[in-house]
């Protein structure tokens, strides 16, 4: 089954500063990546960026910079700008669409210990988009 | 349960252009691609386009390239596709498709006849 | 384009019977992908990924093969059985299908 996996990191020069990363580990190629915030895109969660791997890129505030790492993996730099630091505790959702296959989405969150630059990867939690 | 209900029985004539839905329920249509398949009578199956309802994407097979056109609307969960310069080689049953995470689910079949 | 090649393009066999089918492709490719329709039916997608079974397909059935030659099995033929199967590529646009084996319980 192909998998999705998130992880996030706190930069350690700027603490204000988060990269998600995500990756697709399965056939089939590419069509959309969608990353959002507090949940699930479509089920609460907020929209951060879409990456087309030809189109380009679509991104919103927080969202510093989204772009492709591999052809499989992507990343989402964030800017935080509250002082309460409101990404430690939040959960980002990637959603990778492969043709023909369809859609497969994990969460992630940073580690509650995490130390600045600290980037071991969660358990992946995927979900199926339908059945 | 997920279910693709295509249009009815289409007559039309040679030259002519028809357009022919699929329209999808209980699922995330905008998550995964709609494929169309032409079935002549008495024949195999031929892919002819998908079309990725999110944002519009499609990939069609060179033969269908710039005959027939694929669309969907995302408020209605519907996909179409059109195809024009009707011959009677373009009589068969016509049907759309999803894969989701390995399941596939099909259409009842849009039969095309094309008759002067 | 990619031209799959089934064989036999008709065959039948007794209730019990082992049935094995082929599909040849014109270059190498990385997976097969099996589909079977029975008469005024929609098709279905049997097995997926050259050995995977599409939830629900029985234990019976089994798929095989690399790079040029791919086969599916029926270990022991059911009068539900009957029907024919093509094999697909979603390796190269075109995605094409095979030309059919028909199935058919003696």
């Known amino acids: 089954t192909p998998e999705v996996w998130v992880q996030v990191q706190m930069e350690a020069t700027e603490l204000s500063s988060f990269t998600v990363h995500c990756g697709f580990l399965g056939p089939g190629s590419i069509s959309l990546v969608t990353v959002s915030w507090g949940g699930p895109d479509g089920a609460g969660g907020t929209k951060l960026a879409v990456l087309h791997p030809e189109l380009g890129t679509r991104q919103w505030a927080p969202a510093r910079q989204a772009r492709w790492e591999t052809q499989s993996s992507i990343s989402l730099a964030l800017e935080d700008s509250g002082a309460s630091s409101p990404f430690a505790n939040t959960t980002f959702c990637c959603k990778f669409a492969s043709f023909p296959e369809g859609s497969w989405e994990s969460c992630g969150s940073l580690p509650p210990s995490s130390d600045p630059g600290l980037s071991a990867p969660p358990t992946p939690v995927p979900i199926l988009r339908a059945d | 349960q997920v279910q693709l209900q295509q249009s009815g029985t289409i007559l039309a004539r040679p030259g002519a252009s028809v357009k022919m839905s699929c329209r999808a329920s209980d699922y995330t249509f905008t998550d995964y691609w709609i494929q169309w398949i032409k079935q002549r009578p008495g024949q195999g199956l031929e892919w002819i386009g998908a079309?990725?309802?999110?944002?519009?994407?499609?990939r069609y097979t060179q033969k269908f390239k710039g005959r027939a056109t694929l669309t969907a609307d995302k408020s209605s969960s519907t996909a179409y596709m059109q195809v024009n310069s009707l011959t009677s080689e373009d009589s068969a049953v016509y049907y759309c498709?999803?894969?989701?995470?390995?399941?596939?689910?099909w259409g009842q079949g849009t039969t095309l006849t094309v008759s002067s | 384009q990619i031209v799959l090649i089934q064989s036999p393009a008709i065959m039948s066999a007794s209730p019990g019977e082992k049935v094995t089918m082929t599909c040849s492709a014109s270059s190498s490719v990385n997976n097969i992908h099996w589909y079977q329709q029975k008469s005024g039916t929609s098709p279905k997608r049997w097995i997926y990924d050259t050995t995977k079974l599409t939830s629900g397909v029985p234990a019976r059935f089994s798929g095989s093969g690399s790079g040029t030659s791919y086969s599916l099995t029926i270990s022991s033929m059911e009068a539900e059985d009957a029907a024919t199967y093509y094999c697909?590529?979603?390796?190269?646009?075109?995605?094409?299908f095979g030309g059919g084996t028909k199935l058919e319980i003696k």
């Open positions: 498709a999803t894969f989701i995470n390995y399941v596939d689910y």
């Open positions: 697909q590529q979603w390796n190269i646009n075109p995605y094409t």
């Open positions: 079309i990725f309802p999110e944002n519009g994407d499609t």
